[in-house]
Each structure stands twice: as structure tokens, then as C-alpha cells.
């Protein structure tokens, strides 16, 4: 503990200027005081001043009032500091002395004489209020007051409680009169070292290092740290707990990066095509006729449907097509003929019938042939007659199915596993291979099962020029060439503009 016993001298009266021994002072009693403070004694005895002692300079002559003085010599009130717990009781001896010597340091002068002394014994609590007293004897009177106060940073009824106000890392407080800590605004805890976080700051998710702050723990955000942060990789999602990725409407996948409404958000399908939110890329485009490509961005060739008739060649134009007709034909699709039945325009055994009083004609085609001049062989593969992945082939007036290993039959409808079933026709030799039976055929036969009789194919020698398509007719030596754009002639051998010098049927 630590405190100060303060004694305020107010007035000393010695009207006759007398000493304690009855003698008078010449020319007057030059008065100074000695104060001795010690522990409580029922009977005051000589001995050490256990609580402290102090002397004053000369304060006056005979009778005088003592003014308060805060510094230098003659300080009043007098200060008697102590460094222990104040016990609450004391003994005080105040002596008035006359000195013939130095005013400032009378203690050191020889020949000092006692004028009077008083002794006070009793209890005294620590406090700021002065206790006032007056002592008289036959010759003198002393008015004074005293108190005990605690030194700076010491508090309590015995000045035993140390409290030093601070505002740093170790605490933020002032001191109450009893020495207890009074936290500065925004701080709490035994030593006022815990900040009071922003009001509403989440107790678990948030913390603070200074008042009115709310710092979020990992995974939380917001003013009060009550809102989570989604996963690092999350793209179009939210969370209800940290690092979650709950997808926004229209998004899917672990990180909500798959667009479930790609069609709506991006409109990838072009040219009036239909978009579906499905498929490996999250969408599929269904094209309108005449368009193709992943996004239906590619226009199909307008010539793809072979609109030009009678050997006319087709050329694509921006939004249409144009037919270049061979000699003897005209019209948008070369559908009109300048020929008559006299020109024998019907191929493949077609019968010619006069029309419009002989100014035009119409061909009646035999089975398996079509076209305005019976020039096209009917494609019997259009109905996909071959089962089990068999490949359909047009062969003269009929068609055959080329079966995958392990299958046979006219339509590849029969499943075979080995040569035990004698799959090879016309005396073919069967070989049992890993992918199914293979037939080695005798002369005059071909096909996977030796089922095809080899006949002469008029198109086999490639009689058509300039990339024309060859069609065989009813007789083995008959063929028709379908010319590409820019060429005419029975073998498509003439560029447009040159007269043909050969008949149409070779």
C-alpha cells in the first residue's frame, strides 16, 4: 500500500512570546515545527517516528497564520508519505520550537528551545475530508487539520489496492474510488482486455480485436458474420453452411457450373431450329428441313433432293437452285420435253405415249424403273429391309442384303454362329473365323454367302464422264448417265453449249 498523511497548520498563537520553560524569547519566538507520526500508542512514548517525521522552516514570530503553500520550503499542508497498508489508527506529536538561527533550516541550529507540544492519538479513516482540531495550553494555541489520502494509483480504505489506469494491449480501464477497474467504453472482462464486439456479432462465427468490430471466422461473411461463404469453386450457387454450393435455379453440377437452361440463357440453335436442354453439351438442336450442323447453322444443298429431271444438272443459289437442262428439255425442273415419241425417249423398255396431239409424250416404265424417261432404277433399299445391321445393295432389278458376321438370310434375319449350318450357297466353302463364318465361292458366284450370281454390269466399265452417276437398265448392256451441272450428252461428255453427237442410250 501507499499513502500520505497530510497535516495543515492553520494558526499558532503565543501572545506573550514565552518558551515552555517560562523564559521569553528575545526579540520574539521565531517559531518552527517538528512533527512525528507513529503507530497508535495508548501512552505516547519517545522513540522512532515509525510512520514518518517532518520539520518546517520558521513560519512566523510569536503568533501567526500559516498560509497554504504547494511547493518549495514551508510547504503547507505537510506531507508524511508511507509505503504500507494504512492501519486506521495513529499517534501524532506536534512540537513548536524557537530558533535563534537560520530561518530555512532551523533544525541544524544550536540553542533551539521548545515552545509547546501537543499529542493526538486515535483512529483515522482514509478519505478526502479534513479533520479540524485546536489544542490549547496555558501559553499557546494551535489550530490545524489533517487527513490520510492514498498515493496516485492506490485505492481502498487502507490504500492497499494498486490500480493504474491504462489503455493498451493489457487493458483499457480507469480506477474506481475503491480501486476496482472501470472499463473504458467498448471493453469488458476482469482486466478490461476483451473488446465488446459490434452489437449482434455472431458469438461463434465472429470475434473482434477492438470495440464495435465484427471479424468473421473462415467461411463466414457479412456485418454480423451470420452469412456463409460458398465453396471456392462454386459458380452459380449459394450456401446455408460454409463452403457449400447449393445451385441457383437453372444450374446443376458439383460446382453449379452446368447450365440447365442453356437454351434460354444462350439461344444456341439457329435458323428457327428447336432447342432442348439435354445432351452432352447441355443442349441439342433439332433442325428444320434444309439445315444441318450442331447449331443448325449450315444450310443444306438445295440440290440435295435431286430436283432436276431428265438428266438436268443442278446448281445451288442463295435461297434456291437452278436446273441446267440437256438438249430437248426445258422448264424449272427440266420437266418439259421438246422430244416426241418419234425420238424414242423412254429408257429401260419404257413405253412411250403421245400427249397434246403429239407435241409431247409420257413414258410408262417397267417395274423397277422410274423417272420421266424411266432412266432411274427404283432403289429398293429405301425401306431399310436388312436386319441386324445388314448393308443393302441394289443389284440390277433386285436388291441384296450384305449381312454382318454372325447373320445370314435374305434380310440378314438369321443368326449364325459357325459353319455347322452350311451357310455357303452354290457349293461355297465355309471357313469358321473369329468374327463368324466366311464363304469362299466357286466361279460365277459372289457375296458373303456365295448367293449372288455374277452377271455382266454395264456400269462396271465406268462409261459416264465428268463425275456423272451411272444407272444400269433392263438389258445387261443398257446404262444411263445422270450428268453433273454443266455437262450433257449420253455419257455426260459434252460441256453445256456443245451439240451432242451420240444417242442417249449406249
Amino acid at each position: 500500500g501507499s499513502g500520505i498523511f497530510q497535516l495543515r497548520l492553520q494558526e499558532f498563537v503565543n501572545q506573550r512570546g514565552m518558551l515552555a520553560n517560562g523564559q521569553s524569547c528575545e526579540p520574539g519566538c521565531r517559531t518552527f515545527f517538528r512533527i512525528c507520526l507513529k503507530h497508535f500508542q495508548a501512552t505516547f512514548s519517545e522513540g522512532p517516528c515509525t510512520f514518518g517525521n517532518v520539520s518546517t522552516p520558521v513560519l512566523g514570530t510569536n503568533s501567526f497564520v500559516v498560509r497554504d503553500k504547494n511547493s518549495g520550503s514551508g510547504r503547507n499542508p505537510l506531507q508524511l508519505p508511507f509505503n504500507f497498508t494504512w492501519p486506521g489508527t495513529f499517534s501524532l506529536n506536534i512540537q513548536a520550537w524557537h530558533t535563534p538561527g537560520d530561518d530555512l533550516r532551523p533544525e541544524t541550529s544550536p540553542g533551539n528551545s521548545l515552545i509547546s507540544q501537543i499529542i493526538i492519538q486515535g483512529s483515522l479513516a482514509v478519505g478526502k475530508i479534513w479533520r479540524t482540531d485546536e489544542q490549547n495550553d496555558t501559553l499557546t494555541r494551535l489550530s490545524y487539520s489533517y487527513r490520510v489520502i492514498c498515493s496516485d494509483n492506490y485505492y481502498g480504505e487502507s490504500c492497499s489496492r494498486l490500480c493504474k489506469k491504462r489503455d493498451d494491449h493489457f487493458g483499457h480501464y480507469e480506477c474506481q474510488p475503491d480501486g476496482s477497474l472501470s472499463c473504458l467504453p467498448g471493453w469488458t472482462g476482469k482486466y478490461c482486455d476483451q473488446p465488446i464486439c459490434l452489437s449482434g456479432c455472431h458469438e461463434q462465427n465472429g470475434y473482434c480485436s477492438k470495440p464495435d468490430e465484427c471479424i468473421c471466422r473462415p467461411g463466414w461473411q457479412g456485418r454480423l458474420c451470420n452469412e456463409c461463404i460458398p465453396h471456392n469453386g462454386c459458380r452459380h450457387g449459394t450456401c446455408s453452411i460454409p463452403w457449400q454450393c447449393a445451385c441457383d435455379e437453372g444450374w446443376g453440377g458439383l460446382f453449379c457450373d452446368q447450365d440447365l437452361n442453356y437454351c434460354t440463357h444462350h439461344s444456341p440453335c439457329k435458323n428457327g431450329s428447336t432447342c432442348s436442354n439435354s445432351g452432352p453439351k447441355g443442349y441439342t438442336c433439332t433442325c428444320l428441313p434444309g439445315y444441318t450442323g450442331e447449331h443448325c447453322e449450315l444450310g443444306l444443298s438445295k440440290c440435295a433432293s435431286n430436283p432436276c429431271r431428265n438428266g438436268g444438272s443442278c446448281k445451288d443459289q442463295e435461297n434456291s437452285y437452278h436446273c441446267l437442262c440437256p438438249p430437248g428439255y426445258y422448264g424449272q425442273h427440266c420437266e418439259h420435253s421438246t422430244l416426241t415419241c418419234a425420238d424414242s425417249p423412254c429408257f429401260n423398255g419404257g413405253s412411250c405415249r403421245e400427249r397434246n396431239q403429239g407435241s409431247s409424250y409420257a413414258c410408262e416404265c417397267p417395274p423397277n424403273f422410274t423417272g420421266s424417261n424411266c432412266e432411274k432404277k427404283v432403289d429398293r433399299c429405301t425401306s431399310n429391309p436388312c436386319a441386324n445391321g445388314g448393308q443393302c445393295q441394289n443389284r440390277g432389278p433386285s436388291r441384296t442384303c450384305r449381312c454382318r458376321p454372325g447373320f445370314t438370310g435374305t434380310h440378314c434375319e438369321l443368326h449364325i454362329s459357325d459353319c455347322a449350318r452350311s451357310p455357303c450357297a452354290h457349293g461355297g466353302t465355309c471357313h469358321d473365323l473369329e468374327n463368324g463364318p466366311v464363304c469362299t465361292c466357286p466361279a460365277g458366284f459372289s457375296g458373303r454367302r456365295c448367293e449372288v450370281r455374277i452377271t455382266h454390269d454395264a456400269c462396271a466399265s465406268g462409261p459416264c464422264f465428268n463425275g456423272a452417276t451411272c444407272y444400269t437398265g433392263l438389258s445387261p448392256n443398257n446404262f444411263v448417265c445422270n450428268c453433273p451441272y454443266g455437262f450433257v450428252g449420253s455419257r455426260c461428255e459434252f460441256p453445256v453449249g456443245l451439240p451432242p453427237s451420240f444417242p442417249w442410250v449406249a
Epitope: C216, G219, G222, I229, P230, N232, T238
Partner: antibody
């Protein structure tokens, strides 16, 4: 694909101001907290400021407090950094990044250079 | 604030070999640590978060480990594209702080 594109950098005198912008795409911007991180030439990375996704709460490193302001416009998918009273020590490449002060910075922009010099 | 110290400042390793980079925090960061890769003229790229979780699209040759104050980034078999500067970052305490970086160069 997540993309963050910064703009607004340039040369400015000490005491001057600049406003940086960051355009975000490829993710739902309003769902995520955002930040600015800077890198002085030839030096390491330094967090500058953060803004929450929900209520726009902001945090700043001590050296820029009172001078810099981070903000966002969720309708425009944009993040901003208003820089006032610029000092020479603010010279750096400023990166826009997705993240908070208490989470990793998952995505970064290409950066914009701010040079403070007289 | 927490101080992050990376070592070594420069590491020379041959392609195909193993590289080990270290990061130390001045106090416990409870696994709240990330690693970034930065190539010259480019922005940083997140490699690892929460000490040992691989970020999306990062090759499996990268791995992270550690606890408390010590963390390690390991690249099992170095590829030519792995030579860059690597930064660690703690996000456990406010403010977030980065290490000064380790430059990984070809030996």
C-alpha cells in the same frame, strides 16, 4: 468460364485519385464476396480491401483506411476501388479477386497497374 | 498481424524431380492456409486451400500438408510449366497475410 477484368489503372501524382473497376462474368456475382489484392513491382502480395456479397460490409488494411473505398454494383456485375490521397507506396499492380479476408482467393483478374509518381 | 515466412527464397530443381516448399506462420492458423502459383506477367492462381485440398483443375502432382504453424507444398514430379513463384497465405486471422514467395527455378 470465370472472368475478372480490371481497368482504370494509370499514372497519377501523389495526393491524386483513381477509380479502379472490375467486370465479373462466368459466375453469379451477387452470391460471392470480393476483394482487391495488390503487388508492388518485384514484391509479394498484399491484401487491400474486401466487401461482403450480402450486405456490402467492407474491410481495409490499416495503411489504406480512410483513403480507399471498396464498393460493388451487383446489377452490373462490377467491383470498384476508389483511391484518394494516393502515395508513392501505393504503386502496384492491383488485382480483383473473388474471396473474403477469411477465405482463399479462388479467382483473380489479370491486374491493372497503378503508378503514383511526380 | 500474423507473419508468414517462406523458405527457401529460391529453389533450384531439375524437371522430373520432387520439389518441397515450406511456409511458417508466426502463430497457429488451424489449417486455414492456401498456396498460389504465379508465372511472370500473370496473375496468381489458387493451387491448394485449407492446407491440403486441391483447387479445381490443378494437377494431382501438387499436394499440401501441415498443421499448426508449419505447412508444406510438394510437387511430386516437376514439369516445365511448374517453374514459377509460389506464395502461401493464411486466412485464419484478420488481416489475411501472404508469405514473401519462393521462386522455383530450373536447375
Amino acid at each position: 468460364e470465370v472472368q475478372l477484368v480490371e481497368s482504370g489503372g494509370g499514372l497519377v501524382q501523389p495526393g491524386g485519385s483513381l477509380r479502379l473497376s472490375c467486370a465479373a462474368s462466368g459466375f453469379t456475382f451477387s452470391n460471392f464476396p470480393m476483394a482487391w489484392v495488390r503487388q508492388a513491382p518485384g514484391k509479394g502480395l498484399e491484401w487491400v480491401a474486401t466487401i461482403s456479397s450480402s450486405d456490402g460490409t467492407t474491410y481495409y488494411r490499416d495503411s489504406v483506411k480512410g483513403r480507399f473505398t471498396i464498393s460493388r454494383d451487383n446489377a452490373k456485375n462490377s467491383l470498384y476501388l476508389q483511391m484518394n490521397s494516393l502515395r508513392a507506396e501505393d504503386t502496384a499492380v492491383y488485382y480483383c479477386a473473388r474471396g473474403y479476408y477469411n477465405s482463399p482467393f479462388a479467382y483473380w483478374g489479370q491486374g491493372t497497374l497503378v503508378t503514383v509518381s511526380s | 498481424e500474423i507473419v508468414m515466412t517462406q523458405s527457401p527464397a529460391t529453389l533450384s530443381v531439375s524437371p522430373g524431380e520432387r520439389a518441397t516448399l515450406s511456409c511458417r506462420a508466426s502463430e497457429d492458423i488451424y489449417s486455414n492456409l492456401a498456396w498460389y502459383q504465379q508465372k511472370p506477367g500473370q496473375s496468381p492462381r489458387l493451387l491448394i486451400f485449407d492446407t491440403n485440398n486441391l483447387a479445381d483443375g490443378v494437377p494431382a502432382r501438387f499436394s499440401g500438408s501441415g498443421s499448426g504453424t508449419e505447412s508444406t507444398l510438394t510437387i511430386s514430379s516437376l514439369q516445365s510449366e511448374d517453374f514459377a513463384v509460389y506464395f502461401c497465405q493464411q486466412y485464419n486471422n484478420y488481416p489475411p497475410t501472404f508469405g514473401q514467395g519462393t521462386k522455383l527455378e530450373i536447375k
